[in-house]
């Protein structure tokens, strides 16, 4: 059973993930983007179903395309660096659903825009918390 | 001193169109982003479009998407609203707004027109 | 969309009294570069909304030193240490961090 430690842990390391994800879509979606036209074409897959911590292994699969993406995005209204920002990412979202199950991902049939795919792994993130506390 | 003032206002059946200005004066045009802002009757502000600085990119609520387009003409310093389809909905005071995010203060919309009045209605 | 939320609505205060109104927003308006875009703007009846400040904490110019907003993430305020004549309206907060939006607007009248 998860002890109110771990509980604890596992809240905080959502709030990191839930902040970056949200620093990266307020970084590109806003109308001061210049690339944003650019950025809105390329397609992500979403995940089927995402309701416990093992459907992160859907955005991890998804996390080099998203790195890729973000490369397009530097200008004044983005300083982030992309291979540090995924990279520190990766390392929550392996902590969070845990390296020891291997979790096959199911994609919905539909992709989706990197905005879209933002929205819902912060939706996603927000769930979990709100279960937690 | 900086001035922005709007027209172009008036009344107009449903599906019908409108164009809308917003002349510029007291500072340059060509470096600031440019919105429309509107305001239904006794309601609160609602954002419609931005337009870069040089006309580059251009962004719209959903709630105007594919309706209404913004344009500006720079050599002119005037910042144009074409608002097709009209809806009662539309109904509103428009107020143009300049945008200094590339300045170094980044003050966002910090100078607003007096607005211009346009109602849809049969 | 980022949905801005401002309380009270309406708040009836003294001449010389102060005077506070909040506004909530549904995400983070930290933005990658750093800064926070959320604007508080004053409008009087039949005029437009002017600028009042900037980037949670900064008065734009012109603005009485009365005025003041503070706040971080998702809450922020603005105070108005001692209400005068001419600060009757309505105040809106708004971001810029991503497309704009607005809170609804809080009516501030003298009682």
């Known amino acids: 059973a998860p002890t109110s430690s771990s509980t604890k842990k596992t809240q905080l390391q959502l709030e990191h993930l839930l902040l970056d994800l949200q620093m990266i879509l307020n970084g590109i979606n806003n109308y001061k983007n210049p690339k944003l036209t650019r950025m809105l074409t390329f397609k992500f897959y979403m995940p089927k179903k995402a309701t416990e911590l093992k459907h992160l292994q859907c955005l991890e699969e998804e996390l080099k395309p998203l790195e890729e993406v973000l490369n397009l995005a530097q200008s004044k209204n983005f300083h982030l660096r992309p291979r540090d920002l995924i990279s520190n990412i990766n390392v929550i979202v392996l902590e969070l659903k845990g390296s020891e199950t291997t979790f096959m991902c199911e994609y919905a049939d539909e992709t989706a825009t990197i905005v879209e795919f933002l929205n819902r792994w912060i939706t996603f993130c927000q769930s979990i918390i709100s279960t937690l506390t | 001193q900086v001035q922005l003032v709007e027209s172009g206002g008036g009344v107009v059946q449903p599906g019908r169109s409108l164009r809308l200005s917003c002349a510029a004066s007291?500072?340059?045009?060509?470096?600031?982003?440019m919105h429309w802002v509107r305001q239904a009757p006794g309601k609160g502000l609602e954002w419609v479009a931005v337009i870069w600085y040089d006309g580059s990119n251009e962004y719209y609520a959903d709630s105007v998407k594919g309706r209404f387009t913004i344009s500006r003409d720079n050599s002119k310093n005037t910042l144009f609203l074409q608002m097709n389809s009209l809806r009662a909905e539309d109904t509103a005071v428009y107020y143009c707004a300049r945008d200094d995010w590339f300045g170094e203060a980044d003050y966002g919309m910090d100078v607003w027109g007096q607005g211009t009045t346009v109602t849809v209605s049969s | 969309d980022i949905v801005m939320t401002q309380t009270p609505l309406s708040s009836p205060v003294t001449l010389g009294q102060p005077a506070s109104i909040s506004c909530r927003s549904s995400?983070?308006?930290?933005?990658?570069?750093?800064?926070?875009?959320l604007s508080w703007l004053h409008q009087r009846p039949g005029q437009p909304p002017r600028l009042l400040i900037y980037?949670?904490?900064n008065r734009f110019s012109g603005v009485p030193d009365r005025f003041s907003g503070s706040g971080a993430g998702t809450d922020f305020t603005l105070k108005i240490s001692r209400v005068e004549a001419e600060d009757v309206g309505v105040y809106y907060c708004?971001?810029?961090?991503?497309?704009?939006?607005f809170g609804q607007g809080t009516k501030v009248e003298i009682k």
């Open positions: 980037k949670i904490s």
């Open positions: 007291g500072f340059t045009f060509s470096s600031y982003g």
């Open positions: 708004m971001q810029t961090t991503q497309f704009p939006t």
């Open positions: 995400q983070i308006l930290v933005n990658s570069d750093g800064n926070t875009y």
